[in-house]
């Protein structure tokens, strides 16, 4: 997995006028890292992990940069011509990556009302847009505005690419996010599903990186995909991830089943505990 820094900025308009303030979220290596609230941008580290990245540092630089980006995006939204009644959103996502071979990638993407309409490779400065006519109209509109804006020159796009990578390298220097491995905690629970059946759920939490295998085995052999239900692998706010897998089995057969977990080259197996069945809401 490459190291990545992702900026996600959102501005809103209501009945034709752009609202003040904006929402900014920054993800570092896929983890929520910084956040600015709508009215007053004050970069807030997302959890202890984010605070640890740069220690006691104040986040003035990040606040200044995000505020400037938010202002630019509000101006862009003001120039979009098809402002119909009601609430609309313009979202800019900018991502830069450093791969293991030290190669880099940078891109930015624009979304209007949640729909992608314009992308740019910040290294080649090549623009791409979806085929739909609405997306193309929006894209031309925004591209023309960005070209008109003296700030949005060739130098500007190069700077966006360089700045993103510079910030990413600075964060990585902290060592907190460097290629660490945190093994998961695994917990197996059982709950009543229907007459004679129970649902067994295996939860893995607190692991990093996000790649994990979690599955149920019966008598030592993996169950087929269609007999299991998986949850998404989600950030848990501590710089680590969580996920789950569940399956429905006959009551009394519990001992034949094992949750198998594999993470970063290591595995473990987790049987179903004995005892009373918990009456929990089923995932099914």
């Amino acid at each position: 997995e490459p190291h990545s820094l992702r900026y996600n900025l959102t501005v809103l308009s209501g009945d034709g006028s752009v609202q003040s303030g904006f929402l900014a979220e920054v993800h570092l290596d896929g983890q929520p890292f910084l956040r600015c609230d709508r009215q007053k941008c004050r970069a807030k580290p997302q959890g202890q992990w984010a605070e640890d990245v740069l220690g006691n540092k104040t986040w003035d630089r990040e606040t200044r940069d995000l505020t400037g980006n938010g202002k630019d995006l509000r101006m862009t939204l003001a120039h979009i011509k098809d402002q119909k009644e009601g609430l609309h959103s313009l979202q800019e996502i900018r991502v830069c990556e450093i791969h293991e071979d030290n190669s880099t990638r940078s891109s930015q993407h624009f979304y209007y009302d949640g729909e992608l309409f314009l992308s740019q490779n910040l290294e080649t400065e090549e623009w791409t847009m979806p085929q739909s006519s609405r997306a193309q109209t929006l894209a031309m509109n925004v591209r023309n505005f960005l070209k008109e804006d003296a700030m949005k020159t060739k130098t500007h796009y190069h700077a966006m690419h360089a700045d993103c990578l510079q910030e990413l390298r600075r964060y990585l220097k902290s060592g907190v996010v460097l290629r660490r491995t945190v093994p998961p905690m695994v917990n197996v629970t059982r709950s009543e599903a229907s007459e004679g059946n129970i649902t067994v759920t295996c939860r893995a939490s607190g692991f990093y990186p996000w790649n994990i295998t979690l599955s149920w085995r019966q008598d030592g052999v993996s169950l087929s995909h269609d007999t299991q239900q998986w949850g998404d692998v989600l950030p848990d706010g501590n710089g680590t991830y969580q996920t789950w897998v569940a399956t429905r089995i006959c009551q009394g057969e519990e001992q034949r089943f094992t949750c198998y977990m594999e993470h970063s080259g290591n595995h473990s197996t987790h049987p179903v505990p004995s005892g009373k069945v918990l009456v929990l809401q089923s995932h099914w």
């Epitope: 295998t213 085995r217 019966q218 008598d219 030592g220 052999v221 993996s222 001992q255 034949r256 089943f257 094992t258 594999e262 080259g265 290591n266 595995h267 473990s268 197996t269 987790h270 049987p271 505990p273 004995s274 005892g275």
Partner: antibody
Framework: QVQLQQSGAELVRPGTSVKVSCKAS????????IEWVKQRPGQGLEWIGG????????NYNEKFKGKAILTADKSSSTAYMQLSSLTSDDSAVYFC??????????WGQGTTLTVSS | DILLTQSPASLSASVGETVTITCRAS??????LAWYQQKQGKSPQLLVY???TLADGVPSRFSGSGSGTQYSLKINSLQPEDFGSYYC?????????FGGGTKLEIK
């Protein structure tokens, strides 16, 4: 029928390494985890660790980390255990076994390792 | 780590007798306990798994019982081929430890 055929007895010098093999037959090799167990002369049994032959992922007893390395070759349906920096404490019979869920159902015949100068 | 304490360490009995071997765990192992028999120079053979399920081909004179932290293996009407060593092993959480073993000898 399920069989786990282990390599023959080894007599090795202290400080060297040895690689014990365990060839599986009679079932789909990648479906089941393979475990390794140590038995010192006249002593009880000790779990060393296990490997998933399908992915190569491992699970070691903390006590044997740095001593044993478990690997598997899918093409030959063979699991291996390499033991390094051998001392007389490593002289033992080593068993491979198949994990059938929450118990070990099948065992290899054992490989006797003697470490002596 | 869960410690399994097996008793007795050795036992002398006659053919036809009934014997019981016990295995005490240092924590709840939720019935994830197996019993093995081992003859001199051979590999262990599974007798009982999940505390009380008899493995295929194991004579019905063998039976396992227990729950929580206390488990036992009972052999009714001992036969000459039953003499050897017996081990319990848990599968609740790694490391999967074994009991110290019980050596069953002919009286």
């Amino acid at each position: 029928q399920v069989q786990l055929q282990q390599s023959g007895a080894e007599l090795v010098r202290p400080g060297t390494s040895v690689k014990v093999s365990c060839k599986a037959s009679g079932y789909a090799f990648t479906d089941y985890l393979i475990e390794w167990v140590k038995q010192r002369p006249g002593q009880g049994l000790e779990w060393i660790g296990g490997i998933n032959p399908g992915s190569g992922s491992t699970n070691y007893n903390e006590k044997f980390k740095g001593k044993a390395i478990l690997t598997a070759d899918k093409s030959s349906s063979t699991a291996y255990m390499q033991l390094s920096s051998l001392t007389s404490d490593d002289s033992a019979v080593y068993f491979c076994a198949r994990l059938d869920g929450n118990y070990v159902g099948y065992w290899g015949q054992g490989t006797t390792l003697t470490v002596s100068s | 780590d869960i410690l399994l304490t097996q008793s007795p360490a050795s036992l002398s009995a006659s053919v036809g007798e009934t014997v019981t071997i016990t295995c005490r765990a240092s924590g709840n192992i939720h019935n994830y306990l197996a019993w093995y028999q081992q003859k001199q120079g051979k590999s262990p053979q599974l007798l009982v798994y999940h505390a009380k399920t008899l493995a295929d081909g194991v004579p019905s004179r063998f039976s396992g019982s227990g729950s929580g932290t206390q488990y036992s293996l009972k052999i009714n009407s001992l036969q000459p081929e039953d003499f050897g060593s017996y081990y319990c092993q848990h599968f609740w959480s790694t490391p999967w430890t074994f009991g110290g073993g019980t050596k069953l000898e002919i009286k």
